[in-house]
Protein backbone atom coordinates (compact mmCIF):
# COMPACT_ATOMS: atom_id res chain seq x y z
CA UNK A 1 0.00 0.00 0.00
CA UNK A 2 1.35 3.40 -0.91
CA UNK A 3 0.22 6.48 0.93
CA UNK A 4 0.67 9.96 -0.48
CA UNK A 5 2.83 12.21 1.61
CA UNK A 6 0.71 15.04 2.88
CA UNK A 7 3.84 17.16 3.51
CA UNK A 8 3.22 19.77 6.16
CA UNK A 9 -0.18 20.77 4.86
CA UNK A 10 -3.41 19.45 6.27
CA UNK A 11 -5.57 21.80 4.21
CA UNK A 12 -8.33 20.40 2.00
CA UNK A 13 -7.15 19.00 -1.32
CA UNK A 14 -7.89 21.51 -4.07
CA UNK A 15 -7.55 20.03 -7.53
CA UNK A 16 -6.61 22.29 -10.40
CA UNK A 17 -7.96 20.78 -13.61
CA UNK A 18 -6.13 23.29 -15.76
CA UNK A 19 -2.71 22.23 -14.54
CA UNK A 20 -3.49 18.53 -14.25
CA UNK A 21 -1.00 16.28 -15.98
CA UNK A 22 -2.02 12.89 -17.37
CA UNK A 23 -1.82 10.62 -14.32
CA UNK A 24 1.08 8.22 -14.02
CA UNK A 25 -0.11 4.62 -13.68
CA UNK A 26 1.09 4.26 -10.10
CA UNK A 27 0.85 7.73 -8.59
CA UNK A 28 -1.37 8.38 -5.60
CA UNK A 29 -3.19 11.69 -5.04
CA UNK A 30 -2.38 13.77 -1.99
CA UNK A 31 -4.46 12.86 1.07
CA UNK A 32 -5.32 9.45 -0.39
CA UNK A 33 -4.16 5.90 0.21
CA UNK A 34 -3.62 3.66 -2.79
CA UNK A 35 -3.13 -0.04 -3.37
CA UNK A 36 -2.38 -1.04 -6.92
CA UNK A 37 -2.61 -4.73 -5.97
CA UNK A 38 -6.18 -4.21 -4.72
CA UNK A 39 -6.92 -1.62 -7.44
CA UNK A 40 -8.23 0.58 -4.65
CA UNK A 41 -7.91 4.26 -3.79
CA UNK A 42 -9.20 5.62 -0.46
CA UNK A 43 -9.54 9.36 0.11
CA UNK A 44 -11.57 9.07 3.29
CA UNK A 45 -12.41 11.70 5.92
CA UNK A 46 -9.94 14.20 4.47
CA UNK A 47 -12.29 17.17 3.97
CA UNK A 48 -11.66 17.17 0.22
CA UNK A 49 -13.65 19.86 -1.59
CA UNK A 50 -13.11 18.45 -5.09
CA UNK A 51 -12.50 15.08 -6.66
CA UNK A 52 -8.74 14.58 -7.06
CA UNK A 53 -7.67 15.04 -10.68
CA UNK A 54 -4.67 12.75 -10.54
CA UNK A 55 -6.36 9.43 -9.78
CA UNK A 56 -4.32 6.43 -10.94
CA UNK A 57 -5.55 4.69 -14.08
CA UNK A 58 -5.66 1.31 -12.34
CA UNK A 59 -8.36 2.38 -9.87
CA UNK A 60 -11.26 -0.06 -9.72
CA UNK A 61 -12.62 0.83 -6.26
CA UNK A 62 -12.69 4.47 -5.26
CA UNK A 63 -13.73 5.61 -1.79
CA UNK A 64 -14.35 9.35 -1.41
CA UNK A 65 -16.38 9.14 1.78
CA UNK A 66 -16.54 11.64 4.61
CA UNK A 67 -15.43 14.68 2.64
CA UNK A 68 -16.82 18.17 1.86
CA UNK A 69 -17.48 17.92 -1.85
CA UNK A 70 -20.67 20.04 -1.90
CA UNK A 71 -21.10 19.96 -5.70
CA UNK A 72 -20.40 17.20 -8.18
CA UNK A 73 -20.12 18.94 -11.57
CA UNK A 74 -20.52 17.45 -15.04
CA UNK A 75 -17.54 15.28 -15.88
CA UNK A 76 -16.34 15.16 -12.29
CA UNK A 77 -14.52 11.90 -13.07
CA UNK A 78 -13.71 12.52 -16.74
CA UNK A 79 -10.01 12.09 -17.38
CA UNK A 80 -7.80 11.71 -20.42
CA UNK A 81 -7.20 8.81 -20.69
CA UNK A 82 -10.45 7.79 -18.96
CA UNK A 83 -10.70 5.88 -15.70
CA UNK A 84 -11.69 2.83 -17.71
CA UNK A 85 -11.38 0.35 -14.82
CA UNK A 86 -13.42 2.22 -12.21
CA UNK A 87 -16.19 -0.17 -11.17
CA UNK A 88 -17.19 0.89 -7.66
CA UNK A 89 -17.50 4.50 -6.51
CA UNK A 90 -18.46 5.39 -2.95
CA UNK A 91 -19.25 9.05 -2.25
CA UNK A 92 -21.30 8.53 0.89
CA UNK A 93 -21.27 11.12 3.66
CA UNK A 94 -19.38 13.73 1.64
CA UNK A 95 -21.76 16.66 2.20
CA UNK A 96 -22.89 16.68 -1.41
CA UNK A 97 -25.92 18.88 -1.90
CA UNK A 98 -25.82 19.07 -5.70
CA UNK A 99 -25.17 16.40 -8.32
CA UNK A 100 -25.24 17.85 -11.82
CA UNK A 101 -26.05 16.25 -15.15
CA UNK A 102 -23.24 14.13 -16.54
CA UNK A 103 -21.43 13.92 -13.22
CA UNK A 104 -20.58 10.26 -13.87
CA UNK A 105 -19.88 10.43 -17.59
CA UNK A 106 -16.80 8.77 -19.07
CA UNK A 107 -16.78 5.93 -16.55
CA UNK A 108 -17.48 3.01 -18.89
CA UNK A 109 -17.07 0.29 -16.26
CA UNK A 110 -18.94 1.92 -13.35
CA UNK A 111 -21.13 -0.82 -11.87
CA UNK A 112 -21.74 0.38 -8.32
CA UNK A 113 -22.42 3.94 -7.14
CA UNK A 114 -23.11 4.92 -3.53
CA UNK A 115 -24.35 8.47 -2.85
CA UNK A 116 -25.87 7.69 0.54
CA UNK A 117 -25.91 10.13 3.44
CA UNK A 118 -25.59 13.24 1.30
CA UNK A 119 -28.31 15.91 1.66
CA UNK A 120 -29.11 16.23 -2.05
CA UNK A 121 -31.07 19.42 -2.48
CA UNK A 122 -30.49 19.10 -6.21
CA UNK A 123 -30.13 15.87 -8.16
CA UNK A 124 -30.11 16.59 -11.89
CA UNK A 125 -32.51 14.54 -13.99
CA UNK A 126 -29.45 13.73 -16.08
CA UNK A 127 -27.15 12.77 -13.22
CA UNK A 128 -27.15 9.11 -14.30
CA UNK A 129 -28.12 9.33 -17.97
CA UNK A 130 -25.57 11.99 -18.85
CA UNK A 131 -27.71 13.60 -21.55
CA UNK A 132 -31.16 15.07 -22.05
CA UNK A 133 -31.97 12.76 -24.97
CA UNK A 134 -35.27 10.90 -24.67
CA UNK A 135 -33.31 7.66 -24.97
CA UNK A 136 -29.72 7.82 -23.73
CA UNK A 137 -26.85 5.40 -24.09
CA UNK A 138 -27.34 2.67 -21.47
CA UNK A 139 -25.62 3.35 -18.18
CA UNK A 140 -23.27 0.57 -17.03
CA UNK A 141 -24.65 0.93 -13.48
CA UNK A 142 -25.85 -2.28 -11.85
CA UNK A 143 -26.11 -1.07 -8.24
CA UNK A 144 -27.28 2.39 -7.19
CA UNK A 145 -27.33 3.17 -3.48
CA UNK A 146 -29.26 6.30 -2.51
CA UNK A 147 -30.05 5.78 1.17
CA UNK A 148 -30.67 8.88 3.29
CA UNK A 149 -30.13 11.47 0.57
CA UNK A 150 -33.10 13.60 1.60
CA UNK A 151 -32.05 17.17 2.45
CA UNK A 152 -33.32 19.03 5.52
CA UNK A 153 -36.68 20.72 4.98
CA UNK A 154 -35.18 24.18 4.66
CA UNK A 155 -32.92 23.03 1.79
CA UNK A 156 -35.62 21.35 -0.29
CA UNK A 157 -36.48 22.64 -3.76
CA UNK A 158 -40.06 23.61 -4.57
CA UNK A 159 -40.75 20.36 -6.38
CA UNK A 160 -41.24 17.12 -4.48
CA UNK A 161 -38.14 15.23 -3.46
CA UNK A 162 -39.76 12.00 -4.64
CA UNK A 163 -40.27 13.56 -8.07
CA UNK A 164 -36.70 14.81 -8.28
CA UNK A 165 -35.25 11.38 -7.52
CA UNK A 166 -37.71 9.68 -9.88
CA UNK A 167 -36.75 12.00 -12.74
CA UNK A 168 -33.09 11.04 -12.34
CA UNK A 169 -33.95 7.33 -12.29
CA UNK A 170 -36.04 7.33 -15.47
CA UNK A 171 -34.23 9.91 -17.63
CA UNK A 172 -33.32 8.55 -21.02
CA UNK A 173 -34.18 5.01 -19.90
CA UNK A 174 -30.48 4.82 -19.07
CA UNK A 175 -30.89 2.55 -16.03
CA UNK A 176 -32.57 -0.36 -17.81
CA UNK A 177 -29.77 -2.65 -16.62
CA UNK A 178 -29.97 -1.65 -12.95
CA UNK A 179 -30.22 -4.68 -10.65
CA UNK A 180 -30.08 -3.08 -7.21
CA UNK A 181 -31.66 0.17 -6.04
CA UNK A 182 -31.57 1.31 -2.42
CA UNK A 183 -33.78 4.26 -1.47
CA UNK A 184 -34.06 3.70 2.27
CA UNK A 185 -34.56 6.48 4.82
CA UNK A 186 -35.65 9.24 2.45
CA UNK A 187 -39.00 10.30 3.97
CA UNK A 188 -40.76 9.20 0.76
CA UNK A 189 -44.51 9.65 1.10
CA UNK A 190 -45.20 7.93 -2.21
CA UNK A 191 -43.43 6.20 -5.07
CA UNK A 192 -43.94 7.97 -8.41
CA UNK A 193 -45.92 5.56 -10.53
CA UNK A 194 -43.73 5.53 -13.65
CA UNK A 195 -40.43 4.77 -11.95
CA UNK A 196 -40.54 0.98 -11.66
CA UNK A 197 -41.76 0.56 -15.23
CA UNK A 198 -38.48 2.07 -16.40
CA UNK A 199 -36.33 -0.28 -14.30
CA UNK A 200 -37.25 -3.71 -15.68
CA UNK A 201 -34.04 -5.46 -14.61
CA UNK A 202 -34.38 -4.68 -10.88
CA UNK A 203 -33.62 -7.62 -8.62
CA UNK A 204 -33.34 -5.77 -5.32
CA UNK A 205 -35.40 -2.75 -4.25
CA UNK A 206 -35.00 -1.24 -0.78
CA UNK A 207 -37.67 1.29 0.22
CA UNK A 208 -37.37 0.66 3.95
CA UNK A 209 -37.64 3.38 6.59
CA UNK A 210 -39.68 5.78 4.47
CA UNK A 211 -43.18 7.13 5.01
CA UNK A 212 -45.08 5.16 2.38
CA UNK A 213 -48.75 4.98 3.32
CA UNK A 214 -50.05 3.06 0.32
CA UNK A 215 -48.87 1.09 -2.71
CA UNK A 216 -52.21 1.42 -4.51
CA UNK A 217 -50.76 3.29 -7.49
CA UNK A 218 -47.47 1.39 -7.64
CA UNK A 219 -47.13 -1.45 -10.13
CA UNK A 220 -44.57 -4.20 -9.65
CA UNK A 221 -45.78 -6.14 -12.68
CA UNK A 222 -42.88 -5.10 -14.90
CA UNK A 223 -40.27 -6.19 -12.34
CA UNK A 224 -40.42 -9.77 -13.57
CA UNK A 225 -37.23 -10.85 -11.79
CA UNK A 226 -37.52 -8.87 -8.57
CA UNK A 227 -36.01 -10.93 -5.76
CA UNK A 228 -35.99 -8.66 -2.70
CA UNK A 229 -38.55 -5.97 -1.87
CA UNK A 230 -37.81 -4.17 1.38
CA UNK A 231 -40.78 -2.22 2.74
CA UNK A 232 -39.98 -2.41 6.45
CA UNK A 233 -40.50 0.63 8.68
CA UNK A 234 -42.95 2.53 6.52
CA UNK A 235 -46.49 3.76 7.20
CA UNK A 236 -48.33 1.06 5.27
CA UNK A 237 -51.85 0.37 6.53
CA UNK A 238 -52.91 -2.44 4.20
CA UNK A 239 -51.95 -4.03 0.90
CA UNK A 240 -54.84 -4.23 -1.53
CA UNK A 241 -55.78 -7.02 -3.92
CA UNK A 242 -54.04 -5.56 -6.96
CA UNK A 243 -50.73 -5.33 -5.15
CA UNK A 244 -51.13 -8.78 -3.59
CA UNK A 245 -51.82 -10.36 -6.99
CA UNK A 246 -48.83 -8.66 -8.57
CA UNK A 247 -46.49 -9.80 -5.82
CA UNK A 248 -47.83 -13.33 -5.98
CA UNK A 249 -47.16 -13.33 -9.72
CA UNK A 250 -43.44 -12.63 -9.28
CA UNK A 251 -41.79 -16.05 -8.98
CA UNK A 252 -38.55 -14.93 -7.34
CA UNK A 253 -39.65 -12.22 -4.92
CA UNK A 254 -39.24 -12.13 -1.16
CA UNK A 255 -41.09 -9.27 0.53
CA UNK A 256 -40.09 -7.69 3.85
CA UNK A 257 -42.97 -5.95 5.65
CA UNK A 258 -41.94 -5.65 9.31
CA UNK A 259 -42.77 -2.58 11.41
CA UNK A 260 -45.65 -1.08 9.49
CA UNK A 261 -48.78 0.22 11.27
CA UNK A 262 -51.24 -2.30 9.83
CA UNK A 263 -54.88 -1.34 10.23
CA UNK A 264 -56.86 -4.46 11.06
CA UNK A 265 -60.35 -3.60 9.93
CA UNK A 266 -62.57 -4.98 7.16
CA UNK A 267 -60.16 -3.75 4.48
CA UNK A 268 -57.48 -6.09 5.83
CA UNK A 269 -59.40 -9.31 5.08
CA UNK A 270 -57.86 -9.93 1.67
CA UNK A 271 -54.34 -9.32 2.92
CA UNK A 272 -54.80 -11.69 5.84
CA UNK A 273 -56.12 -14.40 3.52
CA UNK A 274 -53.15 -13.85 1.21
CA UNK A 275 -50.62 -13.91 4.06
CA UNK A 276 -51.93 -17.26 5.25
CA UNK A 277 -51.24 -18.91 1.89
CA UNK A 278 -48.28 -17.02 0.44
CA UNK A 279 -44.65 -18.02 0.70
CA UNK A 280 -43.23 -14.69 -0.43
CA UNK A 281 -43.35 -12.70 2.83
CA UNK A 282 -40.32 -13.03 5.07
CA UNK A 283 -41.19 -13.28 8.78
CA UNK A 284 -44.92 -13.05 8.12
CA UNK A 285 -45.66 -14.49 11.56
CA UNK A 286 -44.21 -11.30 13.09
CA UNK A 287 -46.67 -8.89 11.45
CA UNK A 288 -49.05 -7.34 13.96
CA UNK A 289 -51.91 -4.86 13.99
CA UNK A 290 -51.35 -1.28 15.11
CA UNK A 291 -54.95 -0.06 14.74
CA UNK A 292 -57.71 0.05 15.80
CA UNK A 293 -56.82 0.17 19.47
CA UNK A 294 -58.76 -3.01 20.30
CA UNK A 295 -56.63 -4.94 17.76
CA UNK A 296 -53.21 -3.58 18.72
CA UNK A 297 -50.45 -6.24 18.76
CA UNK A 298 -52.72 -8.97 17.37
CA UNK A 299 -50.81 -11.20 14.95
CA UNK A 300 -52.16 -10.85 11.41
CA UNK A 301 -51.83 -14.56 10.66
CA UNK A 302 -54.05 -15.38 13.64
CA UNK A 303 -56.95 -13.19 12.56
CA UNK A 304 -60.14 -14.46 10.96
CA UNK A 305 -62.86 -12.62 9.09
CA UNK A 306 -64.95 -12.14 12.24
CA UNK A 307 -62.09 -10.12 13.77
CA UNK A 308 -61.94 -7.73 10.83
CA UNK A 309 -64.88 -5.39 10.98
CA UNK A 310 -65.45 -1.77 10.09
CA UNK A 311 -67.59 0.61 12.08
CA UNK A 312 -70.79 1.26 10.15
CA UNK A 313 -70.87 4.63 8.44
CA UNK A 314 -73.81 6.65 9.66
CA UNK A 315 -76.06 8.16 6.98
CA UNK A 316 -75.50 11.94 6.70
CA UNK A 317 -78.82 12.74 8.37
CA UNK A 318 -77.74 10.93 11.52
CA UNK A 319 -74.23 12.34 11.71
CA UNK A 320 -73.58 14.99 14.30
CA UNK A 321 -71.08 17.77 13.95
Amino acid sequence: TSSASSSSSSAPFLASAASAQPPLPDQCPALCECSEAARTVKCVNRNLTEVPTDLPLYVRNLFLTGNQLAVLPAGAFARRPPLAELAALNLSGSRLDEVRGGAFEHLPSLRQLDLSHNPLAYLSPFAFSGSNASISAPSPLVELILNHIVPPDDKRQNRSFEGMVAAALVAGRALQGLHLLELASNHFLYLPRDVLAQLPSLRYLDLSNNSLVSLTYVSFRNLTHLESLHLEDNALKVLHNGTLAELQGLPHVRVFLDNNPWVCDCHMADMVTWLKQTGVVQGKDRLTCAFPEKMRNRVLLELNSADLDCDPILPPSLQTS
Epitope: L180, Y204, H252, R254, G279, Q282
Partner: antibody, heavy 115, light 107 residues
Protein backbone atom coordinates in the same frame (compact mmCIF):
# COMPACT_ATOMS: atom_id res chain seq x y z
CA UNK B 1 -19.62 -10.69 -13.58
CA UNK B 2 -20.37 -13.09 -10.74
CA UNK B 3 -18.03 -16.07 -10.36
CA UNK B 4 -19.14 -19.22 -8.58
CA UNK B 5 -16.41 -21.52 -7.31
CA UNK B 6 -17.54 -25.01 -6.35
CA UNK B 7 -15.71 -27.53 -4.20
CA UNK B 8 -13.78 -30.39 -5.80
CA UNK B 9 -14.87 -33.86 -6.92
CA UNK B 10 -16.09 -36.38 -4.37
CA UNK B 11 -15.82 -40.17 -4.33
CA UNK B 12 -18.09 -41.57 -1.62
CA UNK B 13 -19.43 -44.91 -0.50
CA UNK B 14 -23.10 -45.92 -0.74
CA UNK B 15 -25.07 -44.84 2.32
CA UNK B 16 -22.66 -42.02 3.12
CA UNK B 17 -23.27 -38.28 2.94
CA UNK B 18 -21.50 -35.49 1.11
CA UNK B 19 -21.54 -31.72 1.48
CA UNK B 20 -20.52 -29.55 -1.46
CA UNK B 21 -19.92 -25.81 -1.41
CA UNK B 22 -20.31 -22.89 -3.78
CA UNK B 23 -18.69 -19.51 -3.14
CA UNK B 24 -19.83 -16.37 -4.98
CA UNK B 25 -17.48 -13.53 -5.82
CA UNK B 26 -17.04 -10.81 -8.43
CA UNK B 27 -18.16 -7.31 -9.32
CA UNK B 28 -21.66 -7.83 -10.64
CA UNK B 29 -24.72 -7.85 -8.40
CA UNK B 30 -24.87 -11.17 -6.59
CA UNK B 31 -28.39 -12.47 -6.19
CA UNK B 32 -29.79 -13.72 -2.91
CA UNK B 33 -31.08 -16.88 -4.61
CA UNK B 34 -28.73 -19.81 -5.02
CA UNK B 35 -30.07 -22.73 -7.04
CA UNK B 36 -28.73 -26.28 -7.25
CA UNK B 37 -29.04 -28.44 -10.37
CA UNK B 38 -28.23 -32.12 -11.00
CA UNK B 39 -26.91 -33.59 -14.24
CA UNK B 40 -26.43 -37.34 -14.62
CA UNK B 41 -23.82 -38.46 -17.15
CA UNK B 42 -25.06 -37.85 -20.68
CA UNK B 43 -28.43 -36.62 -19.39
CA UNK B 44 -30.34 -33.40 -19.00
CA UNK B 45 -30.64 -30.97 -16.11
CA UNK B 46 -32.80 -31.39 -13.00
CA UNK B 47 -33.55 -28.57 -10.59
CA UNK B 48 -33.00 -29.66 -6.97
CA UNK B 49 -33.98 -26.52 -5.09
CA UNK B 50 -32.91 -23.03 -4.10
CA UNK B 51 -32.06 -21.04 -0.99
CA UNK B 52 -32.55 -17.34 -0.34
CA UNK B 53 -29.33 -16.40 1.36
CA UNK B 54 -30.70 -13.36 3.24
CA UNK B 55 -33.06 -15.37 5.40
CA UNK B 56 -32.40 -19.04 4.64
CA UNK B 57 -35.79 -19.56 2.98
CA UNK B 58 -35.77 -22.65 0.76
CA UNK B 59 -37.82 -24.17 -2.04
CA UNK B 60 -37.24 -27.82 -2.97
CA UNK B 61 -38.20 -30.01 -5.87
CA UNK B 62 -40.35 -32.65 -4.18
CA UNK B 63 -38.22 -35.35 -5.76
CA UNK B 64 -35.19 -34.20 -3.71
CA UNK B 65 -36.87 -33.57 -0.35
CA UNK B 66 -35.10 -35.71 2.22
CA UNK B 67 -32.19 -36.22 -0.15
CA UNK B 68 -30.78 -32.69 -0.38
CA UNK B 69 -30.46 -30.04 2.33
CA UNK B 70 -29.55 -26.50 1.32
CA UNK B 71 -27.84 -24.06 3.66
CA UNK B 72 -26.00 -20.78 3.27
CA UNK B 73 -23.47 -18.66 5.11
CA UNK B 74 -24.54 -15.11 4.37
CA UNK B 75 -21.36 -13.54 5.71
CA UNK B 76 -19.05 -15.52 3.43
CA UNK B 77 -21.38 -15.61 0.40
CA UNK B 78 -21.07 -19.40 0.41
CA UNK B 79 -23.91 -21.84 -0.17
CA UNK B 80 -23.86 -25.53 0.65
CA UNK B 81 -25.76 -28.63 -0.40
CA UNK B 82 -25.69 -31.80 1.65
CA UNK B 83 -26.75 -35.08 0.05
CA UNK B 84 -27.54 -38.00 2.33
CA UNK B 85 -28.02 -41.79 2.05
CA UNK B 86 -26.17 -41.81 -1.24
CA UNK B 87 -26.81 -44.46 -3.89
CA UNK B 88 -25.53 -44.94 -7.43
CA UNK B 89 -28.50 -42.84 -8.62
CA UNK B 90 -26.90 -39.86 -6.93
CA UNK B 91 -23.73 -40.13 -9.03
CA UNK B 92 -23.85 -36.95 -11.07
CA UNK B 93 -22.40 -33.50 -11.60
CA UNK B 94 -24.04 -30.94 -9.32
CA UNK B 95 -24.11 -27.27 -10.30
CA UNK B 96 -24.86 -24.20 -8.23
CA UNK B 97 -26.44 -21.30 -10.11
CA UNK B 98 -26.90 -17.77 -8.79
CA UNK B 99 -30.01 -15.72 -9.51
CA UNK B 100 -33.71 -16.12 -10.00
CA UNK B 101 -33.13 -16.94 -13.66
CA UNK B 102 -29.92 -18.83 -12.81
CA UNK B 103 -27.83 -16.05 -14.33
CA UNK B 104 -24.41 -17.48 -13.41
CA UNK B 105 -23.34 -21.11 -12.97
CA UNK B 106 -20.53 -22.80 -11.11
CA UNK B 107 -18.19 -25.19 -12.88
CA UNK B 108 -19.91 -28.23 -11.38
CA UNK B 109 -18.91 -30.74 -8.72
CA UNK B 110 -18.69 -34.40 -9.69
CA UNK B 111 -20.03 -36.81 -7.08
CA UNK B 112 -19.32 -40.51 -7.65
CA UNK B 113 -20.99 -43.07 -5.41
CA UNK B 114 -19.12 -46.35 -5.48
CA UNK B 115 -18.15 -49.08 -3.07
CA UNK C 1 -44.99 -30.33 -12.40
CA UNK C 2 -44.78 -28.49 -15.70
CA UNK C 3 -43.24 -30.61 -18.46
CA UNK C 4 -40.85 -28.92 -20.88
CA UNK C 5 -40.38 -30.60 -24.24
CA UNK C 6 -37.63 -29.95 -26.76
CA UNK C 7 -38.84 -32.10 -29.63
CA UNK C 8 -35.53 -32.00 -31.49
CA UNK C 9 -32.79 -33.71 -29.51
CA UNK C 10 -30.06 -33.00 -32.07
CA UNK C 11 -29.68 -30.60 -34.95
CA UNK C 12 -27.04 -30.23 -37.69
CA UNK C 13 -26.38 -26.89 -39.33
CA UNK C 14 -23.68 -25.10 -41.29
CA UNK C 15 -21.65 -22.14 -40.14
CA UNK C 16 -23.49 -18.93 -41.02
CA UNK C 17 -26.90 -20.63 -40.93
CA UNK C 18 -29.92 -19.30 -39.08
CA UNK C 19 -30.88 -21.93 -36.52
CA UNK C 20 -34.11 -22.15 -34.51
CA UNK C 21 -34.58 -24.42 -31.50
CA UNK C 22 -38.07 -24.89 -30.12
CA UNK C 23 -39.45 -25.65 -26.68
CA UNK C 24 -43.00 -26.42 -25.52
CA UNK C 25 -44.45 -26.22 -22.01
CA UNK C 26 -47.28 -28.43 -20.79
CA UNK C 27 -49.16 -25.32 -19.63
CA UNK C 28 -48.97 -21.53 -19.96
CA UNK C 29 -45.76 -20.25 -18.34
CA UNK C 30 -46.42 -16.51 -18.87
CA UNK C 31 -43.11 -15.86 -20.67
CA UNK C 32 -41.02 -17.14 -17.76
CA UNK C 33 -38.82 -19.11 -20.13
CA UNK C 34 -35.01 -19.15 -20.04
CA UNK C 35 -32.42 -20.59 -22.43
CA UNK C 36 -29.06 -22.02 -21.37
CA UNK C 37 -26.04 -23.11 -23.35
CA UNK C 38 -23.90 -26.03 -22.18
CA UNK C 39 -20.55 -26.33 -23.94
CA UNK C 40 -18.88 -29.72 -24.53
CA UNK C 41 -16.59 -29.03 -21.55
CA UNK C 42 -19.66 -28.85 -19.29
CA UNK C 43 -19.77 -25.09 -18.64
CA UNK C 44 -23.28 -23.65 -18.53
CA UNK C 45 -24.30 -20.09 -19.38
CA UNK C 46 -27.60 -18.23 -19.36
CA UNK C 47 -28.34 -16.79 -22.81
CA UNK C 48 -31.91 -15.50 -22.69
CA UNK C 49 -34.30 -14.94 -19.80
CA UNK C 50 -37.99 -14.05 -19.70
CA UNK C 51 -38.46 -15.31 -23.28
CA UNK C 52 -36.54 -12.58 -25.09
CA UNK C 53 -34.26 -10.62 -22.73
CA UNK C 54 -30.60 -11.05 -23.63
CA UNK C 55 -28.38 -11.77 -20.63
CA UNK C 56 -25.40 -9.43 -20.24
CA UNK C 57 -22.44 -10.32 -22.41
CA UNK C 58 -24.41 -12.59 -24.75
CA UNK C 59 -23.89 -11.88 -28.47
CA UNK C 60 -26.82 -10.25 -30.26
CA UNK C 61 -27.03 -13.10 -32.78
CA UNK C 62 -28.99 -14.94 -30.06
CA UNK C 63 -32.66 -14.04 -29.72
CA UNK C 64 -35.74 -15.56 -28.14
CA UNK C 65 -39.45 -15.39 -28.79
CA UNK C 66 -42.74 -17.04 -27.91
CA UNK C 67 -45.68 -16.86 -25.55
CA UNK C 68 -48.13 -19.11 -23.75
CA UNK C 69 -46.74 -22.61 -24.17
CA UNK C 70 -44.55 -22.30 -27.30
CA UNK C 71 -41.09 -20.72 -27.30
CA UNK C 72 -38.03 -20.64 -29.51
CA UNK C 73 -34.35 -19.68 -29.49
CA UNK C 74 -32.82 -18.38 -32.71
CA UNK C 75 -29.16 -18.09 -33.61
CA UNK C 76 -29.06 -15.75 -36.60
CA UNK C 77 -25.58 -16.50 -37.92
CA UNK C 78 -24.14 -19.74 -36.56
CA UNK C 79 -20.53 -19.60 -35.41
CA UNK C 80 -18.17 -22.40 -34.43
CA UNK C 81 -18.27 -21.35 -30.79
CA UNK C 82 -22.06 -21.94 -30.73
CA UNK C 83 -21.60 -25.70 -30.91
CA UNK C 84 -23.22 -26.80 -27.67
CA UNK C 85 -26.35 -28.27 -26.13
CA UNK C 86 -29.20 -25.82 -25.52
CA UNK C 87 -31.72 -26.23 -22.71
CA UNK C 88 -34.96 -24.37 -22.10
CA UNK C 89 -36.26 -23.95 -18.54
CA UNK C 90 -39.42 -22.51 -17.02
CA UNK C 91 -39.36 -20.46 -13.83
CA UNK C 92 -43.04 -19.60 -13.66
CA UNK C 93 -44.19 -22.37 -11.33
CA UNK C 94 -42.22 -24.34 -8.76
CA UNK C 95 -40.52 -26.72 -9.19
CA UNK C 96 -38.51 -25.22 -12.04
CA UNK C 97 -38.18 -27.69 -14.91
CA UNK C 98 -35.87 -28.06 -17.90
CA UNK C 99 -36.33 -29.34 -21.40
CA UNK C 100 -34.32 -32.39 -22.42
CA UNK C 101 -31.86 -30.34 -24.46
CA UNK C 102 -31.06 -29.87 -28.15
CA UNK C 103 -27.52 -30.74 -29.25
CA UNK C 104 -26.30 -28.47 -32.04
CA UNK C 105 -23.67 -29.88 -34.38
CA UNK C 106 -21.87 -28.68 -37.48
CA UNK C 107 -22.75 -30.31 -40.79
Amino acid sequence: EVQLQQSGPELVKPGASVKISCKASGYAFSSSWMNWVKQRPGKGLEWIGRIYREDGHTNYNGKFKGKATLTADKSSTTAYMQLTSLTSEDSAVYFCANGGAMDYWGQGTSVTVSS
Amino acid sequence: DIQMTQSTSSLSASLGDRVTISCRASQDISNYLNWYQQKPDGTVKLLIYYTSRLHSGVPSRFSGSGSGTDYSLTISNLEQEDIATYFCQQDNTLPWTFGGGTKLEIK
